[in-house]
């Protein structure tokens, strides 16, 4: 079954994810043609090769072509149309570049794995969490409440329906006695008295009904602000916390549908109470009294239901998606000068009336006083159309919306004025978009507004990881959406919120956080031995003070070791098998009453690129305590050469009489090596025959490979502390024992 | 209790400028739309401008049009009207007034501002 | 823009008297209109708005009527307190809005 096919299966909520990874520049069009060809392709490839990526681009174009001819032979006009659209698009994005488009086709694809993984976790938790439960009665609860609040308007429908004929009926009545009155013949005095006294009573009536309806709409309208305070001050206020948290790689945050539908049967509700006033007012047009409780009421009414709509309509204007650069989907709100970004505004009160009727209007740092209060703060313009209205049409679950795909920032450059000179650096200066529209109609004239989540603006891509910080810090710490001088002063962070956050960057990118040990680990990096959950963290030790005595920040060297597994390590991480974090002290804790040979993955410390080394142990030399020996670490420079199972699979150590061995024998905690990474090893080239030394392309050259050798026994060393790298003294020390050119050969290990 | 505050009145010369304020309390300011109504001596009532509640429309009769600038900072509560170029014609009190429901009625007005444009 | 004319532009009633002021639109404004009562030296005051709506705390004996583009302020009596200048609204569209000339009422 196609990962397409199954993503079509999913619950709407999930669905909307997928929605969001589409936009202009990939469409989704191509994914649905397409998709059982897009799925076979080696996208990862594609997108680290430019010919290969050239390749797969003109394959695609062809494959487009083909889809065309099937259109063309089913006479399916509007699908050749849309093809030869997408065709063109694909070719004015993406012939420069090929690689762009591997890459978001490759990023698609993994999100939709990804997708796919929480639906299926999330329908697990379903059958037996807590928190779900409590999710599901709160919604419940709401239900209950806005279709109380439609009912109470249907009631009122019909009580205004009786009032009406009641009143037509007592008008009636009075013309009636008053013609007969008026008849020169006259009516017997009793007979008159009788239908005076009826009359009588049927005003009583009727000031009753109108009494009673007035009532009525009050409760309503009590009902109603009871129910919308809790749409808008709890329901929508967490959905945009944990919108927040989804953005720094939290769990998928809730669609939006189900808020949508409530929001929007309120504001019906509303509208026809506007409809239910205007009626009754007619009414009071007709027949009127002293004490009127139409007159006495009506203006009350009117004012709370349009303050009512009005508060409903304002605070339904969202930001659906945050911006987000189309190549970084994992990293929203860090935008790139001159590089695209996509953003989405959703109205909840899905009106058919307000189809077409909004025209928003994006920009950029509006009413932010840190432009005029931060020294240096930068200014910026933005390119692209401004201004885009909402509809049912472009959206693929019919919701109002407006998606901004092509927006890009310049920064203002003021002449003689140096930008770095302020109290923060770029990626901490905090920025705004701003979106602005109005409902305008007869008897309502609304200004909607709302802000994106706090981005930074980076100018080259190295400021990235810097960038992806401040957006870290701030969405894990600030609730409310705009404090954009956050970082002159940044909280501390506790290590349980830190803790889940650093959790949700490994999880977010590949199927696995970290765990508890490995959290242990790092908490004792940033706050020493004594780590504990409500340990404060200061922003400069996350980012920007070295960790320990090594030259670059925790979250640097957490960032490259992130880009490591992504790149060269994901389905070793994925399967649990890199250990990763653990300090030194552990491992040995774990490793020394293991069999020889035993050995576990581990990142480097000590290397600021990103870099995965094995340790493992073995039986000393003098019957005491076992030896550990670690390999120096493999950054992304050996790892592009050799993947790390091959290395596993053939790494050597020179042992006695120079017999090269593989010491490592058993995973941690006892998985044979072969079964934990066989199925990653490369498949053995066909050996070619021994005639045959060109090989099928005939280049004159035998296959070689590469492997890891240590050529000095590690035992020889002693402990894994005097393992590569080293700080200078160090090196000094074991070049005197081992011997300068024993020591360059050992170095060399690939 | 609603209330509205006009500040800022005074003599000036032809060509010269102004700068109305109009203070509010009592009500939710960032609701509602605003307006300035100005009234010549033993004239009528003139609109002269109104702004929506987020200032993100703006609207000015003919006669101002291109030399008024009316603007509103909502978390200070006040609106405000900047007068320049101004003629011997807009010599007249100036009211601002509150624009509320459906019915964009203005239903709570200010004690008036006077403007004198004389030489 | 939507022109207001109003009529008469002043009269002369007697405490107790029905008066009748008149609004009429240059075209259909529905029941977007709003009429004020201005005494000398003071603030306009809100009497109706939507055509026929009493304001709150307005008397009953002050009433609005009509729609679309002929519209009518009854004082069904005349009270001492209600001699003052009275204007009708237009909020249709209410950017601009537009103001009649306004009817002087005077004693009699």
């Known amino acids: 079954m196609s990962q397409w096919y199954e993503l079509q299966q999913l619950d709407s909520k999930f669905l909307e994810q997928v929605h969001q990874l589409y936009d202009d520049s990939f469409p989704m069009e191509i994914r649905q043609y397409l998709a059982q060809w897009l799925e076979k392709q080696d996208w990862e490839h594609a997108a680290n090769d430019v010919s290969f990526a050239t390749i797969r681009f003109h394959d695609l174009l062809s494959q487009l072509d083909d889809q065309y001819s099937r259109f063309s032979l089913e006479n399916n006009f509007l699908l050749q149309h849309n093809i030869r659209k997408s065709k063109r698009n694909l070719q004015d994005n993406f012939q420069e570049d090929p690689i762009q488009m591997s890459m978001i086709i490759y990023s698609c694809l993994k999100e939709e794995r990804k997708i796919l993984e929480n639906a299926q976790r999330f329908n697990q938790a379903q059958s037996g969490n807590i928190q779900s439960t409590v999710m599901l009665d709160k919604q419940k609860e709401l239900d209950s409440k806005v279709r109380n609040v439609k009912d109470k308007v249907m009631c009122i429908e019909h009580e205004i329906k009786s009032l009406e004929d009641l009143q037509d009926e007592y008008d009636f009545k009075c013309k009636t006695l008053q013609n007969r009155e008026h008849e020169t013949n006259g009516v017997a005095k009793s007979d008159q008295k009788q239908e005076q006294l009826l009359l009588k009573k049927m005003y009583l009536m009727l000031d009753n009904k109108r009494k009673e309806v007035v009532h009525k709409i009050i409760e309503l309208l009590n009902v109603t602000e009871l129910t919308q305070n809790a749409l808008i001050n709890d329901e929508l206020v967490e959905w945009k916390r944990r919108q927040q948290s989804a953005c720094i790689g939290g769990p998928p945050n809730a669609c939006l549908d189900q808020l949508q539908n409530w929001f929007t049967i309120v504001a019906e509700s509303l509208q026809q109470v506007r409809q239910q006033l205007k009626k009754l007012e007619e009414l009071e047009q007709k027949y009127t009294y002293e004490h009127d409780p139409i007159t006495k009421n009506k203006q009350v009414l009117w004012d709370r239901t349009f303050s009512l709509f009005q508060q409903l309509i304002q605070s339904s204007f969202v930001v659906e998606r945050q911006p987000c650069m189309p190549t970084h989907p994992q990293r929203p709100l860090v935008l790139k000068t001159g590089v695209q970004f996509t953003v989405k505004l959703r109205l909840l009160v899905k009106l058919q009336e307000l189809n077409y009727n909004l025209k928003v209007k994006v920009l950029f740092d509006k009413d932010v006083n840190e432009r005029n209060t931060v020294k240096g703060f930068r200014k910026f313009n933005i390119l692209g159309t401004h201004t885009k209205v909402m509809n049912m049409e472009e959206s693929t679950n019919g919701s109002l919306a407006a998606e901004f795909r092509h927006l890009q920032l310049k920064e203002q450059k003021n002449a003689g004025t140096r930008t770095n000179e302020g109290p923060l650096i770029v990626t901490e200066e905090l920025h705004s978009l701003s979106f602005e529209t109005q409902l305008c109609q007869p008897g309502l004239v609304i200004d909607l507004e709302t802000t994106s989540l706090p981005v930074v603006v980076i100018s080259n891509v190295s400021q990235l990881p810097s960038g992806w910080a401040s957006i870290l810090w701030y969405n894990m710490l600030v609730a409310e959406p705009r404090n954009l001088s956050f970082f002159l002063t940044p909280p501390c962070a506790r290590w349980a919120q830190l803790s889940e956050v650093l959790s949700w960057q490994f999880s977010s990118v590949t199927k696995r956080g970290l765990n508890v040990d490995q959290l242990n680990m790092l908490g004792e990096k940033l706050l020493g031995p004594n780590a504990s959950p409500d340990g404060l963290i200061p922003w400069t030790r996350f980012c920007k003070e070295n960790i320990n005595d090594k030259n670059f920040p925790f979250w640097l060297w957490i960032e490259s070791i992130l880009e490591l597994i992504k790149k060269h390590l994901l389905p070793l991480w994925n399967d649990g098998c890199i250990m990763g974090f653990i300090s030194k002290e552990r491992e040995r804790a774990l490793l020394k009453d293991q069999q020889p040979g035993t050995f576990l993955l581990r990142f480097s410390e000590s290397s600021r690129e990103g870099a995965i080394t094995f340790t493992w142990v073995e039986r000393s030399q003098n019957g005491g305590e076992p030896d550990f020996h670690a390999v120096e670490p493999y950054t992304k420079k050996e790892l592009s050469a050799v993947t790390f199972p091959d290395i596993i699979r053939n790494y050597k150590v020179m042992a006695a009489e120079n017999i090269p061995e593989n010491p490592l024998k058993y995973l941690y905690p006892n998985i044979d090596k072969d079964h934990a990474f066989g199925k990653y090893y490369s498949r053995p080239k066909e050996a070619p025959e021994p005639m045959e030394l060109d090989g099928p392309k005939g280049t004159g050259y035998i296959k070689t490979e590469l492997i890891s050798v240590s050529e000095v026994h590690p035992s020889r060393l002693q402990t894994t502390d005097n393992l590569l790298p080293m700080s200078p003294e160090e090196f000094d020390e074991v070049s005197r024992i081992v011997g300068s050119v024993e020591f360059d050969s050992m170095m060399n290990t690939v | 209790e609603v209330q509205l505050l006009e500040s800022g009145g005074g003599l000036v010369q032809p060509g010269g400028s102004l700068r109305l304020s109009c203070a509010a309390s009592?009500?939710?300011?960032?609701?509602?739309?605003m307006y300035w109504v100005r009234q010549a001596p033993g004239k009528g009532l003139e609109w002269v401008s109104s702004i929506s509640s987020y200032g993100h429309s703006t609207y000015y009769a003919d006669s101002v049009k291109g030399r008024f600038t009316i603007s509103r900072d909502n978390s200070k509560n006040t609106l405000y009207l900047q007068m320049n170029s101004l003629r011997a014609e807009d010599t007249a009190v100036y009211y601002c007034?509150?624009?509320?429901?459906?019915?964009?009625?203005?239903?709570?007005w200010g004690q008036g501002t006077l403007v004198t444009v004389s030489s | 823009d939507i022109q207001m004319t109003q009529s008469p532009s002043s009269l002369s009633a007697s405490v107790g008297d029905r008066v009748t002021i008149t609004c009429r639109a240059s075209q259909s404004i529905s029941s977007y209109l709003n009429w004020y009562q201005q005494k000398p030296g003071k603030a306009p005051k809100l009497l109706i708005y939507?055509?026929?709506s009493l304001q709150s705390g307005v008397p009953s004996r002050f009433s609005g009527s009509g729609s679309g583009t002929d519209f009518t302020l009854t004082i069904s009596s005349l009270q001492p307190e209600d001699f003052a200048t009275y204007y009708c609204q237009q909020t249709w569209h209410p950017y601009p809005s537009t103001f009649g000339q306004g009817t002087k009422l005077e004693i009699k």
């Open positions: 007034a509150r624009s509320w429901g459906y019915y964009h009625y203005l239903d709570y």
């Open positions: 939507a055509a026929s």
């Open positions: 009592g009500f939710t300011f960032s609701y509602s739309s």
